[in-house]
Interface confidence: medium
């Protein structure tokens, strides 16, 4: 591993038992105090996106070899670090492989690909919610509920770059019934497949389903933003959508370049570079503070492309909520 840290035994390189390298030797990390902030830093270091869990390292096969050492007793990250090596660490004094730390990241490698041609979610609000349709021999087909599972929904959401599946096993409302041929039923996905077409299924077009059994899937909302509290859509307190929840953005490091990206993304012209006082007239937000230390070059098309701390990690209050005023 180029970085001296790796995840071993997972379904992909972004999950598994945590192993670090010291003096040419790979060893494990004890899970004393191991939490989501430590995983967030590790995921960032590995280029694996956001942290999604802190599973036990013993879940991953093959287990650590007996002669392999536990190299670190505890790691304590604040979440601001770029690498595990920057986090406070304690030398081993009492730990066995039963306590090996594990980590699970969102693995962005599968979610940055362009929207594939072979599957879509139709008639929904945006491309991440809707009726499942699959393309076969240049024809779009619906998918029957029979045999459909959360694992299949996970595959679709991942294939579309839409994050996690948040709703499945839902039949379409009448207005969203398909009018296409019904493709197949008895989908049997493991959840690990790269595409829905890789899942075993019943034969093409041979089923007894009706369109009232068409499958509807909703994936985690993609990134979105809005300006609230202003006179129009191009001015106000900035809010971003993450995991289906709107939250504010902290003004640490916020400046002209960040303003410009927001205005550009909203199609609101250029930033009017408001004064500190003008920015504060929209008042503080409530609820989640999603982003802190946002850093843009100004070239980005979306705020999502700018650097920032791990989602939800901040040292701010709502008094520091960002507001943006664009030319419209």
């Amino acid at each position: 591993s180029p970085s001296g840290v790796r995840l071993v035994g997972g379904l992909h390189r972004c999950e598994g038992r945590v192993e670090v390298e010291q003096k040419g030797q790979w060893g494990t990390v004890c899970d004393d105090g191991w939490d989501i902030k430590d995983v967030a830093v590790l995921c960032r270091e590995l280029g694996c996106g956001a942290a999604s869990g802190t599973p036990s390292g013993i879940l991953y096969e093959p287990p650590a070899e007996k002669e392999q050492k536990v190299l670190i007793q505890s790691v304590s990250c604040t979440g601001t670090e770029d690498t595990l090596a920057q986090c406070e660490q304690e030398e081993v004094y009492d730990c066995s492989h039963d306590e090996d730390a594990g980590a699970s990241c969102e693995n962005p490698e599968s979610s940055f690909s362009p929207v594939p041609e072979g599957v879509r979610l139709a008639d929904g609000p945006g491309h991440c919610k809707g009726r499942v349709e699959v393309k076969h021999q240049n024809q779009w087909y619906t998918v029957c509920q029979t045999g459909w599972s959360l694992r299949a929904a996970k595959v679709v959401c991942r294939q579309l770059g839409c994050g996690r599946a948040v709703l499945t096993q839902k039949r379409c409302n009448k207005h969203a019934y398909g009018r296409k041929p019904i493709w197949l039923s008895q989908m049997s996905c493991s959840g690990r497949e790269a595409t829905l077409q890789d899942c075993p299924s019943g034969p093409w077009g041979k089923n007894t389903c009706n369109h009232d059994e068409d499958t509807w899937v909703e994936c985690e909302d993609p990134f979105d933003l809005r300006l609230v509290g202003g006179d129009n859509l191009c001015s106000g307190r900035l809010e971003v959508l993450h995991k289906g929840v709107w939250g504010s953005v902290c003004d640490d490091n916020w400046g002209e370049k960040e303003d410009q990206v927001v205005c550009k993304q909203l199609g609101c012209g250029k930033s009017l570079s408001p004064s500190f006082r003008d920015r504060k007239c929209y008042g503080p937000g409530v609820g989640r503070i999603w982003l802190d230390n946002v850093r843009c070059s100004g070239e980005e098309q979306s705020l999502e492309q700018c650097q920032h701390r791990f989602w939800g990690f901040h040292d701010c209050t709502h008094q520091e909520d960002v507001a943006v005023i664009c030319s419209g």
Epitope: G4, R44, D82, A85, Q86, E88, Q89, R295
Partner: antibody, heavy 113, light 107 residues
Amino acid sequence: QSVEESGGRLVTPGTPLTLTCTVSGFSLSSYAMNWVRQAPGKGLEWIGLIYASGTTHYASWVNGRFTISKTSTTVTLKMTSLTAADTATYFCARDSYSTGNLWGQGTLVTISS
Amino acid sequence: ELVLTQTPASVSEPVGGTVTIKCQASQSIYSSLVWYQQKPGQPPKLLIYGASNLESGVPSRFKGSGSGTEYTLTISGVQCADAATYYCQCSGYNSRVFGGGTEVEIK
């Protein structure tokens, strides 16, 4: 966001000296902070750091002569048993990179009899 | 104790040329290696973090690479403004270490 060092001055060998690093725009409960020094015409030399938790670690050459501590908005470096070899510009720096690397302008410490 | 050996100690290159600075660690390190540029009378300025990530606002002619014990900073198409001293620095277990520095002169 900024860091600013103060307290550097001319002192005689053996005189203790305390340098202060004042931070603004971010919280010391989220970042580790480093002290680094640079003798005239020489390279950068790491002195030590204080983690968000308050735990401190030092370069092996420090040998207990320096102590780092912090309050909610300041990080201090207490120096004892100073000699001419400790003459340098002392920098305070935040230990994070992707969130914006921050260094102060430095404060000059001169040890001379 | 971890030691970072930086080579060469100094280099002179004409405008438009390429400068390569190497940083070798005495043992395998995390990619928590960063590169700084320092000009006289100023604090160091971050160029590269995580061995290869370009800091925001830094020109793309600066490139960091490497893994394990060997790391490199390459400046392609050097300009007069690049005359400075460059340092590598890494984070180890509860410690931070600097390389000795490389002085870059532009002819």
